[in-house]
């Protein structure tokens, strides 16, 4: 099934939105990367997953 | 046939600024993370700089953070970096890499950029 | 920031002869989620752009020839070359995909005796 994130920020760069970070992250890879590579902390994304 | 190939490089002095692009064709650029990766002379293998699918996110390597801007124009499938503030240090073989899963699966051939007076 | 060390820096060998090569990273690069390990590993020739040889430590990528194979995990992994030929001699790095910033290993240069 498609998976869909619930992730939250502490803090929005480059006038980011929301919802522009929800439609970036497309796969559980894209999630992976944005949270090992973008934000460098556990502490910097809370976020689940839900099928 | 993916193809990624580099231009913008060129002799600066420091202190000077560069803008490097790197033309992707063959495949979906949008769906793509992309990286710049630099290699000076004789030496191994530097990442600068990660950039997300849509471009919203972005990351730099400590050495280039406040000098290097990463962008990308998907409706163009161009992706950029600016350089400002130029160091001799930061002479090296630019390359343009494509994200796949943590690995770069392709590799433009890369444009040099020198930092001298 | 995760550190790649390789071993050796150096190394010669002749036609038909395996090479080992060595990486080791200072964390764990296994993503618990997926149980992969993101390790890959390049060829540069002399003069030519990096070649992705492996992925996820051990998964071939395609048109490479199979005497190349990688194996390992968590943080110790291996490039072994079989029957190494002529064309093979070229500079090897190994890469974390885990974590920005992304590192490589130093490189390990495999000449033709």
């Known amino acids: 099934g498609n998976l869909k994130h619930k992730c939250f920020r502490n803090s929005l760069e480059n006038n980011e939105t929301l919802e522009s970070i929800m439609n970036t992250l497309e796969s559980e890879e894209d999630f992976r990367k944005y949270f090992y590579y973008l934000e460098g902390s556990k502490d910097a994304l809370l976020c689940g997953f839900s099928t | 046939e993916v193809q990624l190939v580099e231009s913008g490089g060129g002799l600066v002095q420091p202190g000077g600024t560069l803008r490097l692009s790197c033309a992707a064709s063959g495949f979906t650029f949008s769906n793509y993370w992309m990286h710049w990766v630099r290699q000076a002379p004789g030496k191994g293998l530097e990442w600068v700089s990660v950039?997300?699918?849509?471009?919203?996110?972005?990351r730099y390597a400590d050495s280039v953070k406040g000098r290097f801007t990463i962008s990308r124009d998907n409706a163009k499938n161009t992706l950029y970096l600016r350089m400002n503030s130029l160091k001799p240090e930061d002479t090296a073989l630019y390359y343009c890499?494509?994200?796949?899963?943590?690995?770069?699966?392709?590799w433009g051939r890369g444009t040099q950029v020198t930092v001298s007076s | 920031d995760i550190q790649m060390t390789q071993s050796p820096s150096s190394v010669t060998a002749s036609a038909g002869e395996k090479v080992t090569i060595n990486c080791k990273s200072s964390q764990s690069v296994l993503y618990s989620s997926n149980q992969k390990n993101y390790l890959a590993w390049y060829q540069q020739r002399l003069g030519q752009s990096p070649r992705l040889l492996i992925y996820?430590?051990?998964t071939r990528e395609s048109g490479v020839p199979d005497r190349f194979s990688g194996s390992g995990s968590t943080t110790d992994f291996t490039l072994t070359i079989n029957n190494f030929q002529p064309e093979d001699a070229a500079v090897y790095y190994c890469q974390q995909g885990y974590s920005a910033p992304l590192t490589f290993g130093q490189g390990t240069k495999v000449e033709l005796k």
């Open positions: 950039i997300d699918r849509g471009g919203g996110g972005t």
């Open positions: 996820w430590a051990s």
């Open positions: 890499t494509r994200d796949r899963n943590g690995e770069y699966d392709y």
